[in-house]
């Protein structure tokens, strides 16, 4: 018995075709990806197979003005136009709490929502019951799969699930309900979720009974043979995965952003056991044509998304300092008020020894693209955000030893002078550089603000600790010639759109006045 | 569809002056850092300037310092150069071109200028 | 600083792997450019950063290198990549290497 499995990750609000680098589309003969192409491809394997399921393996949410203005609604609606089988949490399903994912998508959705090891208490446990289930058994042509979700338990420090949902280490909670999926005579047993492409292995080798892993949030891209794009493999698809118990199990993840559609074809035996698999994931570029329909529909909802960008999100009354000969030469305000909003959104009390897990933000003052000029009326727009924001990047969580971090900060002022974006701008960081010392030595006092404390002081940089930082995922992955992140980062989480986190903080705060407060000095 | 279209070019004496001119459209102009780059004919590429996104920063190539100034308007989406005491030399093709080297890297068709009694 | 690239020319057959290099005067990190060259035609953006590929390029291409010296391989010449290629680093001011120009042979 063959089965087609179909599966998406990490589509991340990108519901309209994007640019070969998931930004916003710009040359519309060579985009890719999107809802309305998606739906054509699906649809063609659909007619031409017969067992076919659709998948997706979580991160929906966040990532464009999309997700910000319908707040998960465009989730729903789409992915029940599009006939998905099934959809497993992934952590940024809970960044509007846990309001924000009843109300728009699990009471929305036509497909089952899963996950195994996010278990409820208290008040929400009866409120939340059955809209989200640890497994979902799928009747395909005479067969039928077992589906079981998971979700990382990391999420209490990458998201907003609040304190009524508690996350288990995967492994143990999955093993449980396959067993119980067994014991309902289910030999066909898919692990879609959302904890990255180490745990998926470590899924697919430890967990008795799953056939099949379809993971997330790692975005990761495995291809056999030459990859069509420009996304390099981790791997061949599917990656083999030999068991504790000797069976082969294969695992799959689709990349990121809608540009792909994973395609993977499993053959089983009458017993349910695996007999081979292969596939690769589809490019969706502009030689599949978008669905007309799902397009209409798409540019029905796309009026809303307009009619926000000129709405006010707060007022400043300062100058908001995004000038080039500011922030790539100095502290500047715009800077500290980013970085304020990016450990804003990542306040997370998760334990009493902490005032929070992340005190630490670090920002290129080239990504700073445009000043505000508080004599609009103090007016800020999504607009405004937009051009001091334009590249469509996120503000990501990163572990990092601080001998990274002071390589870093050399980095930052290696070239002093030139106007180049290298320069960083801070939060929870206090930093003084000497410019008369050589390149790679300029650095003369690192103070970083503490975490474990009850009181948040400023205390020396040590080089051995791991420290937690807030940072764009441009420079996550190395860019502005920070090699020595990519390089040495331990973890690396993707985080919420930018232009996101700017308007939350500013329709929080409502009025804003940032000043230059002596983060960055010269000796 | 992202545009850069240049115009302005032309024949002029020696001594003479010529502004040229970038239309942008497609993207979001004032966010980007735009360049002046220029090709002698059959010669190779000769970067002459750059200016920051919100015009606060320039620089030039020693060719041209003191003679050449870019500027920007980026209510109109346009990108300037004013050439001063034109050489036989600064004859070429001139290109203005987002930043260089970066993700979002394009480039106009040129525009000749000719320098020449 | 100062980009010299060499060869300055190159005579090479489709299918054939093809090497430029491009070698820094003094040390520029991976501030690294590479751009493709048609007769009457802007530049194309290939490579930044010394080895990453810009959207839309063909994965035959691939840059490497850090420091003073670069190079920019081409691993199976197709017809349409006989063109000028030029190097050009933004370690400071922009400066272009004088390019290599690749004909068939």
């Known amino acids: 018995w063959e089965l087609t499995i179909l599966h998406t990750n990490d589509v991340h609000s990108r519901l309209e075709q994007t640019s070969e680098d998931s930004s916003k589309c710009v040359n519309a003969s060579r985009c890719m990806g999107g809802v309305a192409r998606l739906f054509t491809k699906v649809q063609q394997i659909r007619r031409a197979e017969p067992n076919v399921l659709l998948l997706d393996a979580g991160d929906q949410y966040q990532g464009t003005i999309w997700f910000t203005v319908y707040k998960g609604a465009e989730v729903a609606h789409f992915m029940n136009a599009l006939r998905y089988d099934a959809m497993a949490l992934g952590n940024h399903e809970f960044d509007n709490g846990v309001e924000g994912l009843i109300e728009p998508l699990l009471k929305e959705a036509k497909f089952p929502i899963l996950s195994a090891n996010i278990k409820a208490k208290g008040p929400l446990a009866s409120q939340i019951s059955g809209l989200y289930l640890p497994y979902k058994v799928l009747p395909v042509g005479d067969e039928v799969v077992g589906i079981v979700g998971y979700t990382s338990k990391e999420t209490p420090f990458l998201s907003n699930p609040g304190t009524n949902l508690v996350f288990e280490d995967e492994i143990t909670a999955l093993q449980p309900e396959v067993d119980k999926l067994k014991t309902l005579n289910v030999n066909k047993i898919i692990a879609l979720g959302h904890s990255g492409f180490e745990m998926d292995k470590l899924i697919a080798q430890k967990v008795r009974g799953v056939d099949v892993v379809v993971g997330g949030h790692s975005n990761t891209f495995l291809y056999t043979g030459n990859p069509p794009s420009k996304e390099v493999p981790a791997g061949k698809y599917p990656f083999i995965v030999t068991s504790d118990d000797g069976r082969k199990v294969p695992v799959v993840q689709a990349y990121a952003f809608g540009k792909y559609l994973g395609y993977l074809k499993i053959e089983f035996d009458e017993r349910g056991n695996v007999i081979s698999s292969h596939g690769n994931p589809i490019l969706l570029n502009s030689s599949i044509p978008e669905d007309p329909s799902i397009k209409a529909d798409i540019n029905k909802w796309r009026i809303k998304l307009d009619n926000y960008s000129t709405q006010e999100l707060g007022k400043t009354i300062v100058y908001l300092d995004g000038s080039s000969q500011s922030c790539r030469f100095r502290e500047c305000n715009m800077g500290n008020l980013i970085c304020d909003a990016m450990i804003n959104n990542n306040l997370r009390h998760t334990d009493e020894m902490f005032w929070n897990h992340v005190s630490m933000c670090i920002l290129n003052g080239g990504g700073i693209r445009s000043p505000i000029d508080e004599r609009n009326n103090g007016t800020i727009t999504w607009e405004n955000l937009a051009a001091v924001l334009p590249f469509g990047g996120t503000f990501d969580l990163v572990q990092l030893k601080g001998s990274t971090l002071k390589k870093a900060f050399e980095h930052s002022v290696h070239r002093y002078g030139q106007s180049t974006g290298e320069f960083l701008q801070v939060g929870g960081i206090h930093v003084v550089y000497d410019l008369s010392r050589k390149p790679g030595d300029r650095v003369v006092k690192l103070d970083v603000l503490c975490t474990k404390c009850r009181v948040p002081s400023y205390d020396p940089l040590k080089m051995d600790e791991v420290y937690k930082v807030i940072l764009p995922n441009f420079l996550a992955n190395g860019g502005d010639g920070f090699q020595m992140i990519k390089d040495e980062l331990l973890r690396h989480d993707s985080g919420d759109q930018d232009i996101n986190v700017v308007s939350t903080y500013i329709s929080k705060m409502k009025v804003i006045y940032p000043a230059v407060e002596g983060r960055i000095k010269f000796s | 569809e992202v545009q850069l279209v240049e115009s302005g070019g032309g024949l002029v004496q020696p001594g003479g002056s010529l502004r040229l001119s970038c239309a942008a459209s497609g993207f979001t102009f004032s966010s980007y850092d735009m360049h002046w780059v220029r090709q002698a004919p059959g010669k190779g590429l000769e970067w002459v300037a750059v200016?920051?996104?919100?015009?606060?920063?320039?620089y030039y190539a020693d060719s041209v310092k003191g003679r050449f100034t870019i500027s920007r308007d980026n209510s109109k989406n346009a990108l300037y150069l004013q050439m001063n005491s034109l050489r036989a030399e600064d004859t070429a093709v001139y290109y203005c071109?987002?930043?260089?080297?970066?993700?979002?890297?394009?480039w106009g068709q040129g525009t000749l200028v000719t320098v020449s009694s | 600083i100062q980009m010299t690239q060499s060869p300055s020319s190159l005579s090479a057959s489709v299918g054939d792997r093809v090497t430029i290099t491009c070698r820094a005067s003094?040390?520029?990190?991976?501030?690294l450019a590479w751009y493709q060259q048609k007769p009457g035609k802007a530049p194309k953006l290939l490579i930044y950063?010394?080895?990453t590929l810009q959207s839309g390029v063909p994965s035959r291409f691939s840059g490497s290198g850090s420091g003073t010296d670069f190079t920019l391989t081409i691993s199976s010449l197709q017809p349409e990549d006989f063109a000028t290629y030029y190097c050009q680093q933004s370690y400071s001011t922009p400066h272009f290497g004088q390019g290599t120009r690749l004909e068939i042979k």
């Open positions: 200016m920051s996104y919100e015009g606060s920063n320039k």
């Open positions: 950063a010394a080895s």
């Open positions: 071109a987002t930043e260089i080297a970066a993700k979002g890297d394009y």
């Open positions: 003094q040390g520029i990190s991976n501030y």
